[in-house]
């Protein structure tokens, strides 16, 4: 819901927007995603800090812990146990890396109103969870696992092996954490609780990454992390199955891999219990075009893991990596054996298929030039999902629901119509078998959360819709945007264009280019923002772009795996190709054009300053990639293959950017780094620096010391204050 | 406060029944491996028996197997012990202790006498 | 089954003496060993679990070690509520079985 234009009589109550307006995150929005406990309750947080327990049925909410209790020990966070019993109060937050935090634990009994007191947890804690029955604990302690039977019981060690940077169970190392699982925790709850799958990483033959914090004391600290680059030596990873009734009785179990896995150098991709015997596995072969789905069974007899061959399934790509930015996982039916899962089709679409027996006889669910994003909840007659199928714009996602009770199959768009203008971006969280789920939408307008009926799809109440964020925008004149495609040699370039309020097409305005584009990444969505660049085009009159080029996502694999091997080449070519159109359309000053990005962003943009094109003026590359040898091996693998000789060496070695350092002397370069950068290494920019120097070539440069890859905290306002002066001084503009 | 009060000993002769009870509060019964723990007079302590959380699994020692039978009601918060076949060297004071993990005993009742004499 | 074999089955000690106590098992148990005190018509009462952790309540003089086959049970310091028989116990197969005991006596 954007603030409708006004006449003119009121344009003059209306303001710019200000830098200051972004760096105090004047207008951020909120979203409600209900805390689910049950079919028909949820849990959350009110203003006040009190934890709520909302009955949808009843219509009727008590507080379960007061704020008092929260505030008692600083509590950041809580956790309800499933038996309703005990709440977990974690304080102490202590950020590690991307997922990963440490922090403090303290268990409040909720029938007595006290914090259980004997056999407390110990502090710091690196995760802990509920089982998803009763209130069973189980936590990762100093590398290693332990177990509770009850929170106020003494606990029971799992793993004894655990060493700092040597060997993780139950939470992953580095590289397990930011490029294939995605969270803080490698442990696995089986349904009732009566397992506990749990990974073991050992890091011992991985090269460590060093580099200095210099705090506050009169010598820095050294950070080493364990970290393989690409080719180096990669962790091993085993996977371990615990009874946690009885886990003293055979000990950890070990789940076997997959022979054709083992053969090689390998990953584990994710675990998905299916009941409390059977457990699903995916594995990926180190040259990530192969994975494979293994379902394993509980022996009784022996206490052992089966996994039978026949119920393997392979899942290969022949054109690019297996699966999107991760391999998918898979929903299970109720039969517990047979799943839904998204993977491409034979006309190279990610859709849904439903695998009873082998993957070659899946059933295709879903089909078109579209793709299905995320399955969110298989019931007994009902797969809710999201796609961008919607009007054909690749940038959107809808929730759609699809009978399986029935044949054939009907499909409805549960959120097509909802708010059409307002939301056109979806997720959605779904509570036990369905029976009502929240409906979060993220824009284009301003945000709203809505609770529907599982049955129905009725709206039963508005959650959250940024009332005050509507009021606060009602004065502010905020930027046009569109979003668009160019068609450009058999390729579809779509773009979001960021206009300033009062856009003229016969003006020439300065360009930015913002850039991402990773492989399986998307820019151009259709979600509410007001930020940088909003600040860019409403107060500066700057015109802003977005472009997702090839290599980018949910637009069929020719587009997503055109990269494949050569990362560094058609990224760029696209993002220039898309300057030239932009060039044509009459309003831009082709002498102010300029590109920036942040990350792979921050590769791509110097990638492209370094073209030799003569299209840009000047560009900022925060936090680069410069050559694909200092990245991460699981994340660079995936799309480059092995730095040998007799794989891919030689594209390794044409995509840097220190190759290109010669080009830069025509351009005006900010390069911008974190000292204390553990995902995209200092290492990075040093090298570009360097070769620049070597080069006498000028440059700008910032650092920001003892920062990580987010420049995070008062390093923010310092970045895009300094990002903001080089822009305007590049464009003419005043201060 | 974890309570475990035995019932049901006595005197038998050989060859007689006995069932012991072990009444169970302070904790959450439904959750956690019950188990029997016996000594005979000025000896030391032998285990006798353990059940599952939710009694389908039962252990017992060599020397009561096919005699006693470890049952329990959950909706009772009880553990029992039916003790068949009887003979002169299961006199023993009988423990009812929480077994957590299958592993320590971390909570005992006070006892039972059970003389088996004629 | 497992055998366990505590040694001395006796011991005479003062006040303030630091007293060992050792338990073998006839094969690796790991960490799973424990740790029992009873007194004279009393129940047995659980000191230490998972060979070196201390149970709640259990007074600091009281330690475990261990791993594998070879376990001791130290007190520090002995005071007089801590004669009392002392027995081991493994938990490792779901079979547990006893030391036969030590008795600490005062000297």
């Known amino acids: 819901l954007r603030p409708s234009r006004v006449h003119n009589s009121e344009e003059n109550t209306m303001r710019a927007l200000t830098l200051k307006d972004i760096l105090n995150g004047t207008f951020s929005y909120k979203t409600f995603f209900p805390n689910w406990i049950s079919g028909q309750e949820y849990l959350h947080q009110s203003a006040d800090n009190n934890i709520v327990l909302y009955n949808i049925e009843t219509g009727q909410s008590y507080t379960i812990l007061s704020n008092r209790t929260m505030k008692s020990v600083n509590a950041s966070n809580y956790g309800l146990s499933p038996d309703r019993q005990f709440v977990y109060l974690e304080s102490d937050y202590s950020k590690l890396w991307r997922y990963s935090y440490t922090a403090t634990y303290y268990i409040y009994d909720l029938s007595n109103g006290e914090f259980v007191r004997g056999n407390e947890l110990p502090r710091p804690i690196q995760y802990l969870c509920w089982s998803p029955v009763g209130s069973k604990l189980a936590y990762v302690y100093q590398n290693n696992i332990y177990l509770k039977q009850r929170p106020g019981d003494p606990p029971f060690q799992i793993t004894f092996n655990g060493r700092e940077n040597k060997i993780f169970n139950g939470i992953p190392d580095w590289v397990y954490e930011e490029e294939m699982l995605a969270t803080k925790y490698a442990l696995w709850w089986s349904p009732n609780g009566k397992f506990l799958a749990y990974a073991e990483f050992n890091d011992t033959d991985i090269p460590v990454i060093a580099y200095s914090y210099y705090g506050d004391e009169q010598y820095p600290r050294t950070i080493n992390i364990p970290y393989p680059k690409a080719g180096a030596k990669n962790p091993v990873v085993r996977i371990f199955i615990i009874d946690t009734t009885y886990p003293a009785y055979v000990g950890p179990q070990e789940v076997p891999v997959p022979a054709m896995i083992a053969s090689s150098d390998y990953y584990f991709s994710w675990l998905t219990w299916v009941t409390d015997e059977r457990v699903c596995l995916q594995w990926l072969k180190r040259v990530q075009n192969v994975s494979v789905l293994s379902i394993c069974d509980f022996r009784e007899d022996w206490q052992t893991w089966d996994c039978p061959k026949t119920q393997e399934h392979i899942e290969e790509s022949r054109t690019g990596w297996a699966g999107g930015f991760f391999v998918s996982t898979p929903v299970f039916s109720y039969d517990a054996i047979s799943y839904y899962k998204i993977f491409s089709d034979k006309d190279g679409y990610k859709h849904i298929h439903y695998i009873k027996d082998t993957v070659e006889n899946a059933i295709q669910i879903t089909s078109g030039k579209w793709e299905a994003i995320n399955i969110f909840r298989v019931t007994q007659d009902s797969l809710f999902y999201s796609s961008n199928e919607f009007e054909e714009y690749p940038g959107r996602r809808n929730i759609y629901r699809i009978s399986i009770g029935s044949y054939p199959p009907s499909k409805k768009c549960v959120t097509c119509h909802l708010r059409k203008e307002r939301c056109q971006y979806y997720t959605a969280s779904f509570s036990d078998y369905a029976k009502y789920y929240a409906l979060v939408c993220y824009g284009p307008g301003i945000p709203i959360s809505t609770l529907h009926d599982g049955r129905t799809d009725q709206e039963i109440k508005i959650l959250e819709e940024n009332k005050e964020l509507e009021n606060a925008l009602k004065n502010i004149q905020l930027p046009k945007e569109e979003i668009k495609k160019l068609e450009v040699d058999e390729i579809t370039l779509w773009y979001k264009m960021i206009l300033p309020p009062q856009f003229d097409r016969s003006k020439k305005y300065p360009l930015l280019i913002q850039v991402y584009g990773g492989p399986c990444s998307q820019s151009v969505r259709s979600v509410f923002a007001v930020n940088w660049i909003s600040y860019l085009a409403s107060k500066e009159g700057m015109v802003i772009a977005l472009v997702d080029g090839r290599g980018t996502a949910f637009q069929g694999d020719k587009l997503l795996y055109a990269v494949y091997r050569k990362l560094g080449v058609y990224e760029v070519e696209d993002q220039i190709t898309a300057v030239r159109k932009f060039i044509e359309m009459g309003f831009i000053d082709e002498k102010r054009i300029a590109i920036w990005g942040w990350s792979y962003g921050g590769y791509v943009s110097s990638l492209a300053l370094a073209s030799g094109t003569g299209l840009f003026k000047c560009g900022i590359a925060v936090a680069p990639v410069s050559s694909w040898e200092y990245y991460a091996s699981v994340y660079t693998e995936r799309f480059m293959g092995l730095p040998t000789k007799d794989d891919n060496l030689e594209h390794y070695k044409n995509s840097t950017v220190m190759a290109r350092a010669e080009y830069f002397r025509n351009v005006d370069y900010l390069l911008i780094h974190g000292t204390a950068d553990d995902n995209v290494h200092f290492q990075n920019s040093a090298q570009i620096a360097k070769a620049l120097v070597n080069a006498q070539v000028d440059f700008q440069a910032m650092w920001y010391s003892d920062q990580n890859h987010g420049l995070s905290g008062l390093s923010t306002n310092h970045l895009y204050t300094h990002m903001t002066h080089f822009l305007k001084q590049c464009f003419s503009l005043s201060d | 406060e974890v309570q475990l009060v035995e019932s049901g000993g006595g005197l038998v002769q050989p060859g007689g029944s006995l069932r012991l009870s072990c009444a169970a509060s302070?904790?959450?019964?439904?959750?956690?491996?019950m188990s029997w723990v016996r000594q005979a007079p000025g000896k030391g302590l032998e285990w006798v028996s353990w059940i599952s959380p939710e009694g389908s699994r039962t252990g017992y020692a060599d020397s009561v197997k096919g005699r006693f039978t470890i049952s329990r009601d959950n909706s009772k918060n009880t553990l029992y012990l039916q003790m068949n076949s009887l003979r002169a060297e299961d006199t023993a004071v009988y423990y009812c202790a929480r077994l957590l993990y299958g592993t320590w005993f971390d909570y005992w009742g006070q006892g039972t006498l059970v003389t088996v004499s004629s | 089954d497992i055998q366990m074999t505590q040694s001395p089955s006796s011991l005479s000690a003062s006040v303030g003496d630091r007293v060992t106590i050792t338990c073998r098992a006839s094969?690796?148990?790991?960490?799973?060993l424990n740790w029992y005190q009873q007194k004279p018509g009393k129940a047995p009462k659980l000191l230490i679990y998972?060979?070196?952790s201390l149970q709640s309540g259990v007074p600091s003089r009281f330690s475990g070690s261990g791993s594998g086959t070879d376990f001791t049970l130290t007190i520090s310091s002995l005071q007089p509520e801590d004669f009392a028989t002392y027995y081991c116990q493994q938990g490792r197969l779901l079979l547990p079985t006893f030391g036969q005991g030590t008795k600490v006596e005062i000297k």
């Open positions: 094969q690796s148990i790991s960490s799973y």
């Open positions: 302070g904790f959450t019964f439904r959750g956690y491996i």
């Open positions: 998972a060979a070196s």
